[in-house]
């Protein structure tokens, strides 16, 4: 912490301006009034403060607003946002998308994924739900940030907003997030025709159950391998060779080059070698011909 000293009269600060870059840390601490700083936050970003000086300014604001900054200050943080920790941000209440845009721009190119995730979370809480305007802002200013939200927060997305989500916005989503988003997407796109539906639902399929994947295999969709490999393991394992062949169409050929990766590897191990041979890929590791498959999990469930 910066030690407290008295401000020399000639150094007294009446407005936030360029002259402050010549102040030492202890002079900034002694001479800058926190309320003045908060009132003139919009000027701070135009002044080339050092990171050390920004630390002092942050300390000032922290003292003035121990319960968290008001949005009027947050909106104008500029590069001071780079000094914020997730713990700081958790105290904020943010409702304005202009504030979100401003801070997302500042964070670009910096390693701030935890801070950005917390900020987005605060915006969703502040606005009450993940509405279309918020989704549009995220996709425009922070591709992939949608996936930084918890499944709980994502559950507040109305199905009507799903159409605004682009495939690249879901690249970093995990299975638990796609589990939440998939049923909403299914609902949002339910009135579309077969091929159009598949193109739209494709990025969300990591959350699809086996029965939906089986249904897709009957529709000539030609699922690409990257999409297939993002399907839930539990959704892939029950599929037959014939179903996978129908599902992937021409892309089934790619199983050979991805046979060491899950879920392809796990699926191969559950198929009869005879059936795998029909794919014309030289895939090995299936259940040898003449072997009997016992599903012990069924017996355990009955006892």
């Amino acid at each position: 912490d910066v030690e407290r000293t008295t401000c020399p009269p000639e150094k007294e600060v009446h407005e936030i301006d360029e002259s402050l870059i010549f102040y030492k840390k202890r002079e900034l601490e002694a001479c800058v009034d926190a309320a003045l700083l908060a009132a003139q936050m919009d000027r701070v970003d135009a002044i080339p403060f050092t990171y050390e000086q920004l630390d002092v300014l942050k300390h000032k604001l922290d003292e003035l607003y121990p319960q968290g900054y008001p949005e009027s200050v947050i909106r104008h943080l500029g590069h001071l946002f780079l000094k914020m920790s997730p713990e700081d941000i958790r105290k904020w209440n943010v409702t304005s998308l202009e504030t979100l845009k401003a801070l997302l721009k500042v964070s670009k190119g910096h390693e701030m994924s935890a801070q950005v995730a917390t900020l987005i979370d605060r915006v969703v809480v502040g606005r009450g739900q993940l509405d279309k305007d918020t989704v549009d802002t995220l996709t425009a200013f922070c591709p992939g940030c949608l996936c930084s939200l918890s499944p709980e927060r994502l559950s507040s997305v109305p199905p009507s907003v799903i159409g605004a989500v682009r495939p690249q916005d879901l690249d970093t989503c995990g299975p638990r997030q796609l589990d939440v988003l998939y049923p909403k997407a299914r609902l949002a796109f339910q009135n579309m025709s077969g091929s159009e539906y598949f193109v739209k639902i494709r990025p969300f399929l990591g959350g699809a159950p086996t029965e939906d994947v089986k249904a897709l295999s009957q529709q000539n969709v030609s699922m690409d391998l990257a999409t297939f490999m993002k399907l839930r393991r539990e959704a892939v394992l029950p599929l037959t060779v014939a179903e996978v062949q129908k599902l992937l169409g021409p892309h089934v050929e790619g199983l050979k080059v991805e046979e060491q990766h899950s879920p392809v590897r796990d699926w191969i191990l559950k198929q009869r070698q005879d059936d795998l041979d029909t794919l014309g890929l030289g895939l090995q590791g299936g259940i040898p011909n003449g072997y009997l498959i016992l599903d012990l999990s069924v017996r355990e469930a009955l006892s």
């Epitope: 391998l225 990257a226 490999m229 892309h251 089934v252 041979d277 014309g280 030289g282």
Partner: antibody
Framework: EVQLVQSGAEVKKPGASVKVSCKAS????????MHWVRQAPGQGLEWMGN????????YYNERFMSRVTMTVDKSTSTVYMELSSLRSEDTAVYYC??????????WGQGTLVTVSS | DIVMTQSPDSLAVSLGERATINCKSS????????????LAWYQQKPGQSPKLLIY???TRESGVPDRFSGSGSGTDFTLTISSLQAEDVAVYYC?????????FGGGTKVEIK
């Protein structure tokens, strides 16, 4: 050594059909898919489709869907590509290419098909 | 369809110098599970069939000289010939095998300056 030997050059009239063959040797024929790619004179490469030699299942580029048929004869390790309703813009060198997984690892020498009235 | 855009269209390089060819796809070619990029590079010498050089964006096909290297991920890829030899005069094509119809770039003609 993997070899793909294609049938000879053909001259066809507009509206006719052409059937190009590709005889494979030097590997287990049913373990690798075959693709067909064409190249118009002085132009780039265009993927036409692929076929599973084990089952005979074939898949086509939608651009050729109604006009192309790919077949296989396992007894002679040969794949065929037939293109119907030929027009002058189908004049091209047609290549068969054996898959290396997804990419095209081995190519035939090409078959020039000329469509002219 | 995925559109593949190659640049430049042609390239004249002195013997022993570096040649760089770029290829851009209209959507990602990265399989985020396996981290494989579904992109291949081919060389076609005058009057010959194409020949595979690189697959998975950066894996050199066996028998291909190590002066050929591929790099890039997602949508932006590069083929580099570190020291151009006379026998490298050819047209070079990138191809995506991420989603059918598999599409090729327009080709880049490499010549000796």
């Amino acid at each position: 050594e993997v070899q793909l030997v294609q049938s000879g050059a053909e001259v066809k009239k507009p509206g006719a059909s052409v059937k190009v063959s590709c005889k494979a040797s030097g590997y287990t024929f049913t373990n690798y898919w075959m693709h067909w790619v064409r190249q118009a004179p002085g132009q780039g490469l265009e993927w036409m489709g692929n076929i599973n030699p084990s089952s005979g299942d074939s898949y086509y580029n939608e651009r050729f869907m109604s006009r192309v048929t790919m077949t296989v004869d396992k007894s002679t390790s040969t794949v065929y590509m037939e293109l119907s309703s030929l027009r002058s813009e189908d004049t091209a060198v047609y290549y068969c290419a054996r898959s290396g997984g997804l990419w095209l690892a081995f190519w035939g020498q090409g078959t020039l098909v000329t469509v002219s009235s | 369809d995925i559109v593949m855009t190659q640049s430049p269209d042609s390239l004249a390089v002195s013997l022993g110098e570096r040649a760089t060819i770029n290829c851009k796809s209209s959507q990602t070619l990265l399989n985020s599970v396996s981290q494989n990029n579904y992109l291949a590079w081919y060389q076609q010498k005058p009057g010959q069939s194409p020949k595979l050089l690189i697959y998975f964006a950066s894996t050199r096909e066996s028998g291909v000289p190590d002066r050929f290297s591929g790099s890039g991920s997602g949508t932006d890829f590069t083929l580099t010939i570190s020291s151009l030899q006379a026998e490298d005069v050819a047209v070079y094509y990138c191809q995506q095998h991420y989603r059918t119809p598999y599409t090729f770039g327009g080709g880049t003609k490499v010549e000796i300056k």
